[in-house]
């Protein structure tokens, strides 16, 4: 905190300029007028300021808009962004993606953090859902974005936007996550043909019930074994073999380096052992020939 | 990506020394660069400033006419010649780089030890 001082005569500043970087911060203080600095914030990023002398700056901002700044100012405030606390970022509404923009760019390289996290959560709370130009600019600055949401915050995701999702935006998504997306997914990407529609739909693919699997198998559609690791566990065990061949195509001989890893192991204990024989492939851990399978939980649902 | 000041040392009054900034990982020509210094106990203070393109220059009252800045962007490097050294211009000496409208990166050196006694 800077005590208050009069300006010493003839320092007064009569604009932003790179003369202030030799004001101590006092005079800055006392010499440099709040709504002068509003006006003129483009020309603070210019200006090689010490972050000591920064910090007076943010106080006269502080001081003029102690209920938060206008976005006049916001989208000018470049480096003097990575000052505001999460606190000061609620106090804002941010509504042009210009802006946006502008202050994503000053975080740029660096790891989201909490100010940019409350920044895009005040943005997006603002529009009242991630559209696809907001989802395409968060995405390219932090490719992670989508899966920092939780399932409730994803389910206010227009199908849409789903157009504006690279695979790498999916890679740290969770399986919950997936589930809200997927549907999303095939909504969006629906009046495709299969081979284009399955390169779409391929990083969604985690979130897909048991159905549109065996449907993917009619397909030729040769899912790797990267994708195939990525389904959920519960849609992949009612598949037969003759499915998981289909959906594999030349792939399939990848299930024997992943027998002891799920989906695949938990897959292959519910199939029959002479059932997978026939891919030739070693697999073992099968239903002995000659067992009985029952479905308690069929026998339940009867009961 | 770094600033890296050099040229600094022990110099008796009246001496002269150059400090150089040089500019690692990225290049100078788009930046503005200030040098500051900062004396034990006291509060860092602006000593010189040049524009991106080297055509304005600006100094603090304490050291006008002594000091001169100036840039040589093909090697990446800023330059502060100090002349007739006085004990108050003891500190420690930094540069900072300043990106300009639509460039908000900023760096900051660690400083080299300037002592004149």
């Known amino acids: 905190e800077v005590e208050k001082t009069a300006c010493p005569s003839g320092k007064k500043a009569r604009e932003i300029d790179e003369s202030l970087i030799f004001y101590k911060k006092w005079e800055l203080e006392a010499c440099v007028d709040a709504a002068l600095l509003a006006t003129q914030m483009d020309r603070v990023n210019a200006i090689p300021f010490t972050y000591e002398q920064l910090d007076v700056l943010k106080h006269k901002l502080d001081e003029l808009y102690p209920q938060g700044y206008p976005e006049s100012v916001i989208q000018h405030l470049g480096y003097l962004f990575l000052k505001m606390s999460p606190e000061d970022i609620r106090k804002w509404n941010v509504t042009s993606l210009e802006t946006l923009k502008a202050l994503l760019e000053v975080n740029k390289g660096h790891e989201m953090s909490p100010q940019v996290a409350t920044l895009i959560d005040r943005f997006v709370k603002g529009r009242g859902q991630l559209d696809k130009d907001t989802l395409d600019t968060l995405t390219a600055f932090y490719p992670g974005y989508l899966c920092s949401l939780s399932p409730e915050e994803l389910s206010s995701v227009p199908p849409s936007s789903i157009w504006a999702v690279r695979p790498q935006d999916l890679d740290t998504c969770d399986p919950r996550q997936l589930d809200v997306l997927y549907p999303k997914a095939r909504l969006a990407f629906q009046n495709m043909n299969g081979s284009e529609y399955f390169v779409k739909i391929q990083s969604f693919l985690g979130g897909a019930p048991t159905e549109d699997l065996k449907a993917l198998s009619q397909q030729n559609v040769s899912m790797d074994l990267a994708t195939f690791m990525k389904l959920r566990t519960d849609a992949v065990l009612p598949l037969t073999v003759a499915e998981v061949q289909k959906l594999l195509g030349p792939h399939v001989e990848g299930l024997k380096a992943e027998e002891r890893h799920r989906p695949v192991r938990d897959w292959i204990l519910r199939q029959r052992q002479d059932d997978l024989d026939t891919l030739g492939l070693g697999l073992q851990g099968g239903i002995p020939n000659g067992y009985l399978v029952l479905d308690l939980s069929m026998q339940e649902a009867l009961s | 990506l770094q600033l890296v000041e050099s040229g600094g040392g022990l110099v008796q009054p009246g001496g002269s020394l150059r400090l150089s900034c040089a500019a690692s990982g990225f290049t100078l020509d788009y930046y503005a660069i200030g040098w500051f210094r900062q004396a034990p106990g006291k509060e860092r203070e602006g000593v010189s400033y040049i524009s991106s393109s080297g055509g304005s220059t600006n100094y603090a009252d304490s050291v006008k006419g002594r000091f001169t800045i100036s840039r040589d962007n093909a090697k990446n490097t800023v330059y502060l010649q100090m002349n007739s050294l006085k004990p108050e211009d003891t500190g420690v000496y930094s540069c900072?780089?300043?990106?300009?409208?639509?460039?908000?990166?900023?760096?900051w050196g660690q400083g080299t030890s300037v002592t004149v006694s």
């Open positions: 900072a780089a300043a990106g300009g409208y639509g460039n908000t990166s900023r760096y």
